[in-house]
């Protein structure tokens, strides 16, 4: 067990803070909840503290919760491939470019680390080149989320990892909006981290609303499990 992994044996409180600017529309989001890495489970609630969110909530899911991949459930035989937990408590910087097909892009930078007993994800997001009447600024996405695999490779030069994946957002007219994600994670501290073999995170997310919440918000339940590396059985004759 890595030193960081010991921090995730129980339920851990999570705080998410995002400052965003998309085509000049500035906004802030605060989120709170908890993660349980034993089950790869995240429960989070987010509010836009600046009024109405200028972009659809589903376009921010990867920035919020795929941002705290330290809560992914790594099976016993894959624990030595868990970069995310090994970087804790000092944490990691996560940078992404998210390119929406035939539309604009988000660039995000986040610091994910422990502050006391809380895992904090502080994010800056900048979005440019979006069409004012497109699927994103035109709010044409359905309020739901598909299952995805996040493919992870080691980045030995930067002592971190890279990840690539495509998100499929459902559009109200029945079509799909693709969002290409290019992700890079580097440790904040200078302690040893685990650099993984190639594998993937299998992610399932459910979006809902709190009927009593008056502010623009999103409730998120997510399960994430690492896979893609076979278990080696040693046979003794």
């Amino acid at each position: 067990m890595s030193k960081g992994e010991e921090l995730f044996t129980g339920v851990v409180p999570i705080l998410v803070e995002l400052d965003g600017d998309v085509n000049g529309h500035k906004f802030s989001v605060s989120g709170e909840g908890e993660g349980d890495a034993t089950y790869g489970k995240l429960t989070l609630k987010f509010i836009c503290t600046t009024g109405k969110l200028p972009v659809p909530w589903p376009t921010l899911v990867t920035t919020f919760s795929y941002g705290v991949q330290c809560f992914s459930r790594y099976p016993d035989h894959m624990k030595r491939h868990d970069f995310f937990k090994s970087a804790m408590p000092e944490g990691y910087v996560q940078e992404r470019t998210i390119s929406f097909k035939d539309d604009g892009n988000y660039k995000t930078r986040a610091e994910v680390k422990f502050e006391g007993d809380t895992l904090v994800n502080r994010i800056e997001l900048k979005g440019i080149d979006f069409k004012e009447d497109g699927n994103i600024l035109g709010h044409k996405l359905e309020y739901n989320y598909n299952s995805h695999n996040v493919y992870i490779t080691a980045d030995k030069q930067k002592n971190g990892i890279k990840a690539n994946f495509k998100i499929r957002h459902n559009i109200e007219d029945g079509s799909v909006q693709l969002a290409d994600h290019y992700q890079q994670n580097t440790p904040i501290g200078d302690g040893p981290v685990l650099l993984p073999d190639n594998h993937y995170l299998s992610t399932q997310s459910a979006l809902s609303k709190d009927p009593n919440e008056k502010r623009d918000h999103m409730v998120l339940l997510e399960f994430v499990t690492a896979a893609g590396i076979l278990e080696h059985h040693h046979h003794h004759h």
């Epitope: 605060s30 609630k45 503290t49 009593n212």
Partner: nanobody
Framework: DVQLVESGGGLVQAGGSLRLSCAAS?????MAWFRQAPGKEREFVGG????????YYVDSVKGRFTVDRDNVKNTVYLQMNSLKPEDTAVYYC?????????????????WGRGTQVTV
Amino acid sequence: DVQLVESGGGLVQAGGSLRLSCAASGPTGAMAWFRQAPGKEREFVGGISGSETDTYYVDSVKGRFTVDRDNVKNTVYLQMNSLKPEDTAVYYCAARRRITLFTSRTDYDFWGRGTQVTV
């Protein structure tokens, strides 16, 4: 557990002002005021985050009511101006363990017993 005690309620004429106080027995996160009129559900009125960077008010009180807090005294206040008969209710103070300001009742961990405001 944290105890919350409200004070400052009373009878006031329409157009008048009242300042409600809520003293907490220890540190809290976000704090809010809810109200409940006879025969109606308890509703969020206004609140302030634990970091004091975020406040929020329902439309019916915006511009008339103000929430502020004193973290040294572990006290939150509700300044009510230009009071209307429809503001008549029992006003409850509520607190969360954590800092984010939500408006849903179910997000609050601690509640006071309420103070009556009659306009």
